[in-house]
């Protein structure tokens, strides 16, 4: 994978609630950062930004948790454990609309990839997903 | 193509590192279809502490 | 009981919009995607696209994209499928259908509405 | 897109006869959804991820295949199991749908 800057969002998406933050195009991220507490106040996902009706409310329910004796990744004394992921999306071109957070495809994948994992891993503890980044391949 | 590059977070001690790859590989035909992405090359590794967004620079898969 | 009651026929004319609804009960409407697919007289079954009530996000087929737009109202439980630019292939019975997200995805989609006539003649 | 192919496009056949449809991918699919269709109705789920049946299915369908082929057999037809029938697949964006075998009475 090249090397290249790329567009990148701080934003935390998460189960239950979730945190808008501005998103620049820079190289570096803004750190992740943990909610104080897990809330269940329904609210939108991140960056949303599909037409929608004026009067629709979105929201995502925080699942059952589940506990397990699984050795994980060092943690913060907040409790959480961070995995950093990477994969490749074969049928999608990068192109310069990928560095720019403000771009609709660039909304559009990071709106895909926030719900893919939302769904994915709702069954366990899991919290969220920050810093996604987009780089060509 | 597109490489994608992000950080998961967990309760702690509720999944590590093979099952958040198991997880998302599991998913990956699904996802194909439902958000027409055709995944591939998946790395997963710890975050290494304490977390910075920095530490993403070191990670090339 | 699960159930998707769509709106009624309609008749338009080349070149107008249709805004077809699809109100849903007896399970939680934010939980499941909603698809739109669509039969010409005669014809397969086409894919329209889906929306998911739970974030509002929603996808095309790359046919469509351009003249179909997807809503929904969480509040009033009900999704609607608007196509415009209306042609005379548009004549279809619309249908909206439930399914599933992760990891349940594979249960495909399970109940559908009675299917809305839509009818483009000049 | 990926191309479903059923076959044949309609049969007749008998209550009591044993049934085979057929669906065929222009390329692999990890499993297919069949439907059942009768006239002026919507559709309704019959078979999903290839071979496990629906709520209230009878117990004489079953479903089959892997890769390109799948089959939706009828052990022995009933009177109200004359309808048409699709197959979808889901494996690749956007989801395809066969053009259908109707099945008729001889």
């Known amino acids: 994978a090249s090397g290249s800057a790329s567009g990148s969002a701080s934003t935390l998406v998460h189960n239950g609630t979730s945190a808008r933050a501005t998103t620049t195009p820079a190289s570096k991220s803004t750190p992740f950062s943990i909610p104080s507490h897990h809330s269940d106040t329904p609210t939108t996902l991140a960056s949303h930004s599909t037409k929608t009706d004026a009067s629709s409310t979105h929201h995502s329910s925080v699942p059952p948790l589940t506990s397990s004796n699984h050795s994980t990744s060092p943690q913060l004394s907040t409790g959480v454990s961070f995995f950093f992921l990477s994969f490749h999306i074969s049928n999608l071109q990068f192109n310069s609309s990928l560095e720019d957070p403000s771009t609709d495809y660039y909304q559009e994948l990071q709106r895909d990839i926030s719900e893919m994992f939302l769904q994915i891993y709702k069954q366990g503890g899991f919290l969220g997903l920050s810093n996604i980044k987009f780089r060509p391949g | 193509s597109v490489v994608v590059q992000l950080t998961l977070a967990f309760r702690e001690g509720t999944i590590n590192v093979h099952d958040v790859e198991t997880q998302f590989n599991q998913y990956k035909t699904e996802a194909a279809s439902r958000y027409n992405l055709t995944i591939s090359d998946v790395s997963v590794s710890d975050v290494p502490f304490p977390f910075s967004a920095q530490s993403h620079h070191h990670h090339h898969h | 009981e699960v159930q998707l009651v769509q709106s009624g026929a309609e008749v338009k004319k080349p070149g107008a919009s249709v805004k077809v609804s699809c109100k849903a009960s007896?399970?939680?409407?934010?939980?499941?995607?909603i698809n739109w697919v669509r039969q010409a007289p005669g014809q397969r079954l086409e894919y329209i696209g889906w929306?998911?009530?739970?974030?509002?996000?929603?996808k095309f087929n790359e046919k469509f994209k351009g003249r179909v737009t997807l809503t929904v109202d969480t509040s009033a439980r009900t999704a609607y499928m608007e196509l415009s630019s209306l042609r005379s292939e548009d004549t279809a019975v619309y249908y909206c259908?439930?399914?599933?997200?992760?990891?349940?995805?594979?249960?495909?989609?399970?109940?559908w509405g009675q299917g809305t006539t839509v009818t483009v003649s000049s | 897109d990926i191309q479903l192919t059923q076959s044949p496009s309609s049969l007749s056949a008998s209550v009591g006869d044993r049934v085979t449809i057929t669906c065929s991918a222009s390329s692999s699919v990890s499993y297919i959804h069949w439907f059942q269709q009768k006239p002026g109705k919507a559709p309704k789920l019959w078979i999903y991820?290839?071979?496990n049946l629906a709520s209230g299915v009878p117990s004489r369908f079953s479903g089959s295949g892997s890769g390109t082929d799948f089959t939706l057999t009828v052990s022995s037809l009933q009177p109200e199991d004359f309808a048409t029938y699709y197959c979808?697949?889901?494996?690749?964006?956007?989801?395809?749908f066969g053009g259908g075998t109707k099945v008729e009475i001889k």
């Open positions: 979808q697949q889901r494996s690749s964006y956007p989801p395809t």
């Open positions: 991820s290839t071979s």
């Open positions: 259908a439930r399914d599933y997200p992760f990891p349940s995805y594979h249960y495909g989609m399970d109940y």
């Open positions: 007896g399970y939680t409407f934010t939980d499941n995607y």
């Open positions: 929306i998911y009530p739970g974030s509002g996000n929603n």
